[in-house]
């Protein structure tokens, strides 16, 4: 079953390499188990950045070594990706799956273009 997923078109990462965006899905009701995956598309290649399964009403739990964190509220997931560098610039796609109860629903957003600009190194100071 297809499900609409909305996410912002463009986000600019902070100078510390952190980017946040909201992924909203048009749920037909209250799924008790939801899986959220962030995919990165660059040069026609798609790679999985991170994924989390959460029970409705609970926090998203990404793996300990994940570069993603997130919180959920109703049909919205607030995603934060950290440790980004200029080479990580690309289209970040939010994929939402309603895992339980059945039937299974899948929604894939159009993607958020995240621009990352590496900070200029501070010039040496004589003072």
């Amino acid at each position: 079953k297809a499900m609409h997923v909305a996410q912002p078109a463009v986000v600019l990462a902070s100078s510390r390499g952190i980017a946040s965006f909201v992924c909203e899905y048009a749920s037909p009701g209250k799924a008790t188990e939801v899986r959220v995956t962030v995919l990165r598309q660059a040069d026609s290649q798609v790679t999985e950045v991170c994924a989390a399964t959460y029970m409705m009403g609970n926090e998203l739990t990404f793996l300990d070594d994940s570069i993603c964190t997130g919180t959920s509220s109703g049909n919205q997931v607030n995603l934060t990706i950290q440790g980004l560098r200029a080479m990580d610039t690309g289209l970040y796609i939010c994929k939402v799956e309603l895992m339980y109860p059945p039937p299974y629903y899948l929604g894939i957003g159009n993607g958020t273009q995240i621009y990352v600009i590496d900070p200029e190194p501070c010039p040496d100071s004589d003072f």
Epitope: A26, P28, K30, G74, P102
Partner: antibody, heavy 118, light 107 residues
Framework: DVQLQESGQGLVKPSQSLSLTCSVT?????????WNWIRQFPGNKLEWLGY???????YYNPSLKNRISITRDTSKNQFFLKLNSVTSEDTATYFC???????????WGQGTTLTVSS | DIVMTQSQKFMSTSVGDSVSVTCKAS??????VAWYQQKPGQSPKPLIY???YRYSGVPDRFTGSGSGTDFTLTISNVQSEDLAEYFC?????????FGAGTKLELK
């Protein structure tokens, strides 16, 4: 496409039980979703009565106390409403409808009118 | 139970006009609100779900908005086939409940 069709008595005497059937085509009631009964009183007020889930689970509107039972026959892809001790207050059009858990109703039957009268 | 209040039982409009039907929930229901259209002798048909998402095949002149306790269904460029009764519905909490309906009539 999914279709739901109600059938059953049109006239019931007070204090008796009403029994209605919802026949589903185009989707197996055991594959997913929740299968509901909703009624619409004269004047058009809608009231959700209860559901039977794809897994056989039930939940009923507390306003109906212990008068309601929703069951199913998976071999016929049908589910049923039984309402005991009816009064004239139960006169309404009864709809069956499908929803995702705690969700909106995407498919409805055409409704069957039930009158409680002696 | 959550009470969904549609304060206007009737609304008058003209073809080509824009009209807004409102619904107020007795407690916060987030965005778990749907709108249905019902014509005489027919079952309710879903128009909007999750507050603002149009159901498949629904014309884009129907838009939904709101969150929390206040919700609106707006019909722009009203057509004669839009003359019907409109119900809001909360699916945040069981028992699921409906508004009393707003009937759209011609002026």
């Amino acid at each position: 496409d999914v279709q739901l069709q109600e059938s059953g008595q049109g006239l019931v005497k007070p204090s008796q039980s009403l029994s209605l059937t919802c026949s589903v085509t185009g989707y197996s009631i055991t594959s997913g979703y929740y299968w509901n009964w909703i009624r619409q009183f004269p004047g058009n007020k809608l009231e959700w009565l209860g559901y039977i889930g794809y897994d056989g689970s039930n939940y009923y509107n507390p306003s109906l106390k212990n008068r309601i039972s929703i069951t199913r026959d998976t071999s016929k892809n049908q589910f049923f409403l039984k309402l005991n001790s009816v009064t004239s207050e139960d006169t309404a059009t009864y709809f069956c409808a499908r929803n995702y858990y705690s969700g909106y109703f995407d498919f409805w039957g055409q409704g069957t009118t039930l009158t409680v009268s002696s | 139970d959550i009470v969904m209040t549609q304060s206007q039982k009737f609304m008058s409009t003209s073809v080509g006009d824009s009209v807004s039907v409102t619904c107020k929930a007795s407690q916060n229901v987030g965005t778990y609100v749907a709108w249905y259209q019902q014509k005489p002798g027919q079952s309710p048909k879903p128009l909007i779900y999750s507050t603002s998402y149009r159901y498949s095949g629904v014309p884009d002149r129907f838009t939904g908005s709101g969150s929390g306790t206040d919700f609106t269904l707006t019909i722009s460029n009203v057509q004669s086939e839009d003359l019907a009764e409109y119900f809001c519905h909360q699916y945040d909490t069981y028992p699921l409940t409906f508004g009393a309906g707003t009937k759209l009539e011609l002026k």
